[in-house]
């Protein structure tokens, strides 16, 4: 499998972590989240060429079958391999609450 | 969130489990796998419209940001939520061995 940074399509074009700045309004959270007001959303974006950051055997199979049947089988997809935690302060009927989310911000990426 | 089977794009067009029949040659396994000669590969294929089978909070964020910035943020992607194990009979230097793979066949799917 290729090294995660060795993208055959050119630097930065393959599956990797990107940061997108989003307001509560962008996320549709303005009516239930108080803080933070803006989130630096880390997400996985980019192409998954042959065996690039293949997550597992399934990803390798998908690559092989996509090569054979590109109209039937899609290429592997760039998705989070793990997440970073985040705390949100939310509005509740009685005031505010602290809520912890472990599946909100991507930490690193792979192809599957 | 929509029910997993309630695809707004029409029946069978959203993220779901598909089976693709593949030979050892198709998979590039002919030189190291003896059996099975053919694999019923279960994989996740289909579109991920708004909140359809959203895996977690990250998938929900991705949907919101894709709607806002479709050229920057891709839609969520249909990937395995879990796997079924599979046994392969492999060639070895000394003969054959039985090997179980836990990450080869998709069991069910979600969008992320």
């Amino acid at each position: 499998a290729r090294n995660g940074d060795d993208c055959p399509l050119g630097p930065g074009r393959c599956c990797r972590l990107h940061t997108v700045r989003a307001s509560l309004e962008d996320l549709g959270w303005a009516d239930w989240v108080l803080s933070p007001r803006e989130v630096q959303v880390t997400m996985c974006i980019g192409a998954c060429p042959s065996q690039f950051r293949a997550a597992n055997m399934h990803a390798q199979i998908k690559t092989s079958l996509h090569r054979l049947k590109p109209d039937t089988v899609p290429a592997p997809c760039c998705v989070p391999a793990s997440y970073n935690p985040m705390v949100l302060i939310q509005k509740t009927d009685t005031g505010v609450s602290l809520q912890t989310y472990d599946d909100l911000l991507a930490k690193d990426c792979h192809c599957i | 969130a929509r029910n997993g089977d309630d695809c707004p794009l029409g029946p069978g067009r959203c993220c779901r489990l598909h089976t693709v029949r593949a030979s050892l040659e198709d998979l590039g396994w002919a030189d190291w796998v003896l059996s099975p000669r053919e694999v019923q590969v279960t994989m996740c294929i289909g579109a991920c419209p708004s909140q359809f089978r959203a895996a977690n909070m990250h998938a929900q964020i991705k949907t919101s940001l894709h709607r806002l910035k479709p050229d920057t943020v891709p839609a969520p992607c249909c990937v395995p939520a879990s796997y079924n194990p599979m046994v392969l009979i492999q060639k070895t230097d000394t003969g054959v061995s039985l090997q179980t793979y836990d990450d080869l066949l998709a069991k069910d799917c979600h969008c992320i």
């Epitope: 108080l34 803080s35 933070p36 007001r37 803006e38 970073n84 935690p85 985040m86 705390v87 949100l88 302060i89 005031g95 505010v96 609450s97 602290l98 912890t100 472990d102 | -």
Partner: antibody, heavy 118, light 107 residues
Framework: QVQLQQSGPELVKPGASVKLSCKAS????????INWVKQRPGQGLEWIGW????????KYNEKFKGKATLTVDTSSSTAYMELHSLTSEDSAVYFC???????????WGQGTTLTVSS | DIVLTQSPATLSVTPGDRVSLSCRAS??????LHWYQQKSHESPRLLIK???QSISGIPSRFSGSGSGTDFTLSINSVETEDFGMYFC?????????FGGGTKLEIK
């Protein structure tokens, strides 16, 4: 750059009240939450409460309910903490801390020393 | 309330030493643990967030690890400017609580 400037030291009598201030500069006041933290001499840190500057919503540590009142004045970019019915146990350094992510405290004021003594 | 217990209370080290400071939570707090340094007569300074994430402007010799109930702050080669108090803080649930602190002093 983000700065939190706290009011000067206070010497007050038991039973009285005092209002400490924390003036923010270098950022949009409503973009950061303000927390207040107590530190008694030679001791650890205690979280008193949190306030959302945009509309003044606050959350208190149960231990400080009735003891502390948090308010903000957005026109002057200033957060306030009023402490009531003071006793010697309230003698401490009080910090305001600005938080972008509400989980932790990124920016701290220099602290205000409160001495309660007759 | 979640209780954070730091150990040791005092750590005497020589510049150049590698040190590890411990923070133990009374219940699982996932990764919701942050570390601060406080020098005498100064405000605390954030060193590490979410157990292991680095902070811009903080020297790379500071690192954090752990999850659940056991956390460690490591300084891989202590410098003279590192001496002072170190506190951990949890944000898993309100009220936020801090550990009692570890004093890092020169041997």
């Amino acid at each position: 750059q983000v700065q939190l400037q706290q009011s000067g030291p206070e010497l007050v009598k038991p039973g009285a009240s005092v209002k400490l201030s924390c003036k923010a500069s270098g950022y949009t006041f409503t973009s950061y939450d303000i927390n207040w933290v107590k530190q008694r001499p030679g001791q650890g840190l205690e979280w008193i409460g949190w306030i959302y500057p945009r509309d003044g919503i606050s959350k208190y540590n149960e231990k400080f309910k009735g003891k502390a009142t948090l308010t903000v004045d957005t026109s002057s970019s200033t957060a306030y903490m009023e402490l009531h019915s003071l006793t010697s146990e309230d003698s401490a350094v009080y910090f305001c801390a600005g938080t972008y992510d509400p989980a932790y405290f990124d920016y701290w004021g220099q602290g205000t020393t409160l001495t309660v003594s007759s | 309330d979640i209780v954070l217990t730091q150990s040791p209370a005092t750590l005497s080290v020589t510049p150049g030493d590698r040190v590890s400071l411990s923070c133990r939570a009374s219940q699982s707090i996932s990764y919701y643990l942050h570390w601060y340094q406080q020098k005498s007569h100064e405000s605390p300074r954030l060193l590490i967030k979410y157990a292991s994430q680095s902070i811009s402007g903080i020297p790379s010799r500071f690192s954090g690890s752990g999850s659940g109930t056991d956390f460690t702050l490591s300084i891989n080669s202590v410098e003279t400017e590192d001496f002072g108090m170190y506190f951990c803080q949890q944000s898993n649930s309100w009220p936020y609580t801090f550990g009692g602190g570890t004093k890092l002093e020169i041997k």
